[in-house]
């Protein structure tokens, strides 16, 4: 994929950021060993990766969380990779679910999501979780990215 | 990414190898259904994938392990994807953590790591785990690879 | 990887389909937000992705399942990514294993598999699981795909 100016590489990898917001959408930052190939992909409002060019993208997210069955709702921890396209409904691209651990005070688990999707110009992808307070933000544990095929 | 001689495909996929070494760095081999596209990526000392060309790479690892909560330390099983670049800090690129199972004698779990990173010429990537004796080496369970975008 | 007619992009992403068949091979469909780049990759019999061109492919699968330790066999839930090449034995490319949850009625878990492999013209890849009745088919939970490097 080493490409000329007509067809530059487009890739991003961003790092999780703890947030005081109560939203279920995870927050990300360009820090540490992040990747942002050029301005054809951008991190907007710390929450979504937005692409300027139409095409096929491999999109991935990894979420590590720490939860306990007794202290959590009965529903599992779910991470969702979602898509927002101009003039379209938001949609779920990928989801993963892990039942809470019985370990005390909490048990760590990691989820990995990844798939190939067609994105339109201006499309944004973001990651939703059932309980953002359970997400682990230690070095390397939670990240989000994409690459254009 | 079908490329000319100027820009050949660069990809590798190597297979886990049980090791008597006490090191936390996993060992790999070019065996079974492995991939080694050319000499622009090499497996060095059975422990690290080293690249000759600078660029963006999607790097991944999968580790399956079998552990038991009572027989293991309280800390979770952690797999780390790490980077060594000449004259730079070694660094953690990605990590995943899974709390040990209560299943007897041990409970199997699988971890998947993957992300896009810029590598310099001569950079090496390797995989660290908290307890290599718990890693499963059956066909297909534990592997490590990369592809150049 | 934006390519000319000589070297078109080849990618697929298909969505799990519940099946009344007793086979351990998962069933897939071109539905929802699926990807099928062109006829150089096809979904055959709803169960395997078949490629027309030789080359290196990144192949992945994600399986979410819900199981309970008491109601399941003692063996873990295993997902396998397998390869069928013309005139060759079938082979396991990747496997992941997760011990069943103690949660009632069942505990959800997600498995992700992915790796780079050389495929021959006419090669097919498919996904096997130990118990297809435990697989979750809700939006985004279980999917399968590939992309040609």
């Amino acid at each position: 994929m080493q490409k000329g100016d007509q067809n530059p590489q487009i890739a991003a990898h961003v790092i999780s950021e703890a947030s005081s917001k109560t939203t279920s959408v995870l927050q990300w930052a360009e820090k540490g060993y992040y990747t942002m190939s050029n301005n054809l992909v951008t991190l907007e409002n710390g929450k979504q990766l937005t692409v300027k060019r139409q095409g096929l993208y491999y999109i991935y997210a990894q979420v590590t969380f720490c939860s306990n069955r007794e202290a959590s709702s009965q529903a599992p921890f779910i991470a969702s990779l979602c898509l927002k396209s101009p003039g379209r409904f938001e949609r779920i691209l990928l989801r993963a679910a892990n039942t809470h651990s019985s370990a005390k005070p909490c048990g760590q688990q990691s989820i990995h999501l990844g798939g190939v999707f067609e994105l339109q110009p201006g499309a944004s992808v973001f990651v939703n979780v059932t309980d953002p307070s359970q997400v682990s933000h230690g070095t390397g544990f939670t990240s989000f990215g994409l690459l254009k095929l | 990414m079908q490329k000319g001689d100027q820009n050949p495909q660069i990809a590798a996929h190597v297979i886990s190898e049980a090791s008597s070494k006490t090191t936390s760095v996993l060992q790999w081999a070019e065996k079974g259904y492995y991939t080694m596209s050319n000499n622009l990526v090499t497996l060095e000392n059975g422990k690290q994938l080293t690249v000759k060309r600078q660029g963006l790479y999607y790097i991944y690892a999968q580790v399956t392990f079998c552990s038991n909560r009572e027989a293991s330390s309280q800390a979770p099983f952690i797999a780390s994807l790490c980077l060594k670049s000449p004259g730079r800090f070694e660094r953690i690129l990605l990590r995943a953590a899974n709390t040990h199972s209560s299943a007897k004698p041990c409970g199997q779990q699988s971890i998947h790591l993957g992300g896009v990173f810029e590598l310099q010429p001569g950079a090496s990537v390797f995989v660290n785990v908290t307890d290599p004796s718990q890693v499963s080496h059956g066909t297909g369970f534990t592997s490590f690879g990369l592809l150049k975008l | 990887m934006q390519k000319g007619d000589q070297n078109p992009q080849i990618a697929a992403h298909v969505i799990s389909e519940a099946s009344s068949k007793t086979t351990s091979v998962l069933q897939w469909a071109e539905k929802g937000y699926y990807t099928m780049s062109n006829n150089l990759v096809t979904l055959e019999n709803g169960k395997q992705l078949t490629v027309k061109r030789q080359g290196l492919y990144y192949i992945y699968a994600q399986v979410t399942f819900c199981s309970n330790r008491e109601a399941s066999s003692q063996a873990p839930f295993i997902a396998s990514l397998c390869l069928k090449s013309p005139g060759r034995f079938e082979r396991i490319l990747l496997r992941a294993a997760n011990t069943h949850s103690s949660a009632k009625p069942c505990g959800q878990q997600s498995i992700h598999l992915g790796g780079v492999f050389e495929l021959q013209p006419g090669a097919s890849v498919f996904v096997n699981v130990t118990d297809p009745s435990q697989v979750s088919h809700g939006t985004g939970f279980t999917s399968f795909g590939l992309l040609k490097l």
Epitope: H13, E30, K31, G32, Y33, T35, H137, T139 | L56 | -
Partner: nanobody, 124 residues
Framework: EVQLVESGGGLVQPGGSLRLSCAAS?????????MGWFRQAPGKEREFIAV????????LYADSVKGRFTISADNSKNTAYLQMNSLKPEDTAVYYC????????????????WGQGTLVTVSS
Amino acid sequence: EVQLVESGGGLVQPGGSLRLSCAASGRTFSSIYAMGWFRQAPGKEREFIAVIYWRDGSTLYADSVKGRFTISADNSKNTAYLQMNSLKPEDTAVYYCAAEPYGSGSSLISEYDWGQGTLVTVSS
């Protein structure tokens, strides 16, 4: 820019211990992503020894020092430490402290901030 000052080097017998310190001043500590140590023996290239991530205290070590050296940090004092035990003659080198800025990214080789170095000599 962060100013880094190392101390604690000196002459020690094989099997002995030393504790190196690296005090940071200048740019606020929150702008440091990682801090660590390299060493350079006469006629050899500078080699990585250990690193600590400020975010969560995660550490990595070179194979040559694993189990013998321990890196730690005291955020309140803006200081990183390298505890060196079971020292060997081959550990003789100038030890340099380095700091990596917060938003360094993978697509650019960020400039580290460096200390001036402290000499460690292991000899009987």
